[in-house]
């Protein structure tokens, strides 16, 4: 799988300038070479603290691995040093430079930095496996609703063409290990599991290898089981309102529900001077409820036209489904027409239960 990026053989201790962010440099070194990767700050500006990462894991400095803010040196390189390297901003984890490094059996020519190496050009160069799109392999955690399908991919290359195998929680993973089996596509470097269930949770590792080396990537799968819940009402809605006599007012209520919700708008009223009945239930009148041709969207808005002083008071958005009910309330204050409009002090939702 070609990236269309420059691929060249780099001589011993050659320093490789970093590619533009978002591009990927494919580099080949000989066994025993010093790998030097350089990642200057984008636009020449300040870089801030950085971290160097290989195959998704932060590199630990050692006598052989020399880590600087803009440069990485790996001395006496071997096959195990092949892989995907990136330089990232420490705080944001933003990738500043990508490199795909292959360390081949033979030492590199030492002089040739322009990609004119004959073995490389003729495609007979041997090399350990490497990820063809390492920047796509940064994400490691996949959370999937049960009953859906999962695909893990580890596209790689190498010469000879590497083989791919899969592990689950560190052990060989085969079709007979799960109900429904698995589907492997070696030419797509992929593992597919249909209709996942909670027992599919775990760590899945692809192991890509040829006689020159081996690389691996581990993904974590979480299978989500939904637990039904009563409707959720968006915080802050409906909001308290202050309106001038004769003006129009809208209250909004945003409802989230798995099960089909039933939405009602209620106005709190007094009966014989009391706001609540003997059992403590508020007295309300239903202003708006579902009809044959009303949509949920329409029910999420309560419109009051040409308001009077009688419209002042407490309004409640009540939403119910098969699991339970939720409600939020807000107040309407009506001012005389000649008064200046004053915002309600306690703007926002009054949560009622």
């Amino acid at each position: 799988e070609s990236l269309g990026t420059e691929q060249r053989v780099v001589g011993r201790a050659a320093e490789v300038p970093g590619p533009e962010p978002g591009q990927q440099e494919q580099l080949v070194f000989g066994s025993g070479d010093a790998v030097e990767l350089s990642c200057p700050p984008p636009g020449g500006g300040p870089m801030g603290p950085t971290v160097w990462v290989k195959d998704g894991t932060g590199l630990v400095p050692s006598e052989r691995v020399l880590v600087g803010p803009q440069r990485l040196q790996v001395l006496n390189a071997s096959h195990e040093d092949s892989g995907a390297y990136s330089c990232r901003q420490r705080l944001t984890q933003r990738v500043l430079c990508h490199f795909s490094v292959r360390v081949t059996d033979a030492p590199s020519s030492g002089d040739d930095e322009d990609g004119e190496d004959e073995a490389e050009d003729t495609g007979v160069d041997t090399g350990a496996p490497y990820w063809t799109r390492p920047e796509r392999m940064d994400k490691k955690l996949l959370a999937v609703p049960a009953a859906n399908t999962v695909r893990f991919r580890c596209p790689a290359a190498g010469n000879p063409t590497p083989s791919i195998s899969w592990l689950k929680n560190g052990r060989e993973f085969r079709g007979e290990h799960r109900i429904g089996g698995i589907k492997l596509r070696h030419q797509q470097w992929s593992l597919v599991m249909e209709s996942v269930v909670p027992s599919d949770r775990g760590n899945y590792t692809c192991v890509v290898e040829n006689k020159f080396g081996s690389i691996r990537q581990t993904y974590t799968l979480d299978v989500l089981e939904r637990s039904p819940h009563r409707p959720i009402l968006q915080a802050g809605l409906p909001a308290n309102q202050t309106a001038v006599l004769g003006s129009d007012v809208e209250f909004h209520c945003k409802v989230y529900s798995d099960a089909q919700p039933h939405i009602q708008w209620l106005k709190h009223v007094e009966v014989n001077g009391s706001k609540v009945g003997p059992d403590g239930t508020p007295y309300v009148t239903v202003l708006k409820t579902a009809g044959a041709n009303t949509t949920d969207k329409e029910l999420e808005v309560l419109s009051l036209h040409n308001v009077t002083f009688e419209d002042a008071g407490e309004y409640t958005c009540l939403a119910g489904n098969s699991i339970g009910f939720s409600h939020h309330s807000a107040w309407l204050v009506v001012l005389p027409a000649e008064e200046e409009l004053v915002e309600a002090d306690e703007a926002g939702s009054v949560y009622a239960g």
Epitope: R136, K139, A147, R151, R226
Partner: antibody
């Protein structure tokens, strides 16, 4: 056995409304999604929209956005297609289909596959 | 929108023939392509998903291949029940779009 049964089709005047139902059985309703696909007489298939039954999220084709609404009642295992402001070009057989996602970290989209379909219900918009 | 173009629009073949239908996307859709089969007056049926994965219960004479913009559905040995209209459909982009269909008729 997975089954989807549409109902609610019929003759309606331009500008009118209709609500189609899709009753599902044989699978865990809230785990996957329901798509609506239509087929005008003698024509090909056109995707109308989709809802994810777990989180209630919806997507619509531009041709129906603002006029059609997909919803679901998980207690009844039923999805709905509310069609308002109907036009002559909405005349078609409407199918609902169970829709599952193929989740893949390697790409930045979810592939959606419609694996079980209902028998379809005919909606005719005519004066 | 991503346009899906199938070819041919129709073809005539005999039982036992090998039949190939192609589908071209107006932009790269990776392997996010499904194939459906529809008989007159019936609902479509899923055959292939993700370009090359055979859906469960579908006979192995059906196979799919391709990635990017060019895809192929192959029926290795046409059977009487395979005479139908076949649609490809992509779902990388919004909205999901179908090809115009390929009608496979009896020669």
């Amino acid at each position: 056995e997975v089954q989807l049964v549409e109902s609610g089709g019929g003759l309606v005047q331009p500008g009118g409304s209709l609500r189609l139902s899709c009753a599902a059985s044989g699978f865990t309703f809230t785990s996957t999604g329901i798509s609506w696909v239509r087929q005008a007489p003698g024509k090909g298939l056109e995707w109308v929209g989709r809802t994810h039954l777990g989180d209630g999220s919806t997507n619509y084709a531009d041709s129906v956005k603002g006029r059609f609404t997909i919803s679901a009642d998980t207690s009844k295992n039923t999805a709905y297609l509310q069609m308002n402001s109907l036009r002559a070009e909405d005349t078609a057989v409407y199918y609902c289909a169970r829709t599952y996602g193929i989740y893949d970290l390697y790409v930045d989209y979810t592939e959606y596959v419609m694996d079980y379909w209902g028998q379809g219900t005919l909606v005719t918009v005519s004066s | 929108d991503i346009q899906m173009t199938q070819s041919p629009s129709s073809l005539s073949a005999s039982v036992g023939d090998r039949v190939t239908i192609t589908c071209r996307a107006s932009q790269d859709v990776d392997t996010s392509l499904a194939w459906y089969k529809q008989k007159p007056g019936k609902a479509p049926k899923l055959l292939i998903y993700s370009a090359s994965f055979l859906y469960s219960g579908v006979p192995s004479r059906f196979s799919g291949s391709g990635s990017g913009t060019d895809f192929t559905l192959t029926i290795s040995s046409l059977q009487p029940e395979d005479f139908a209209t076949y649609y490809c459909q992509q779902s990388t982009g919004h909205p999901q779009t179908f090809g115009q269909g390929t009608k496979v008729e009896i020669k």
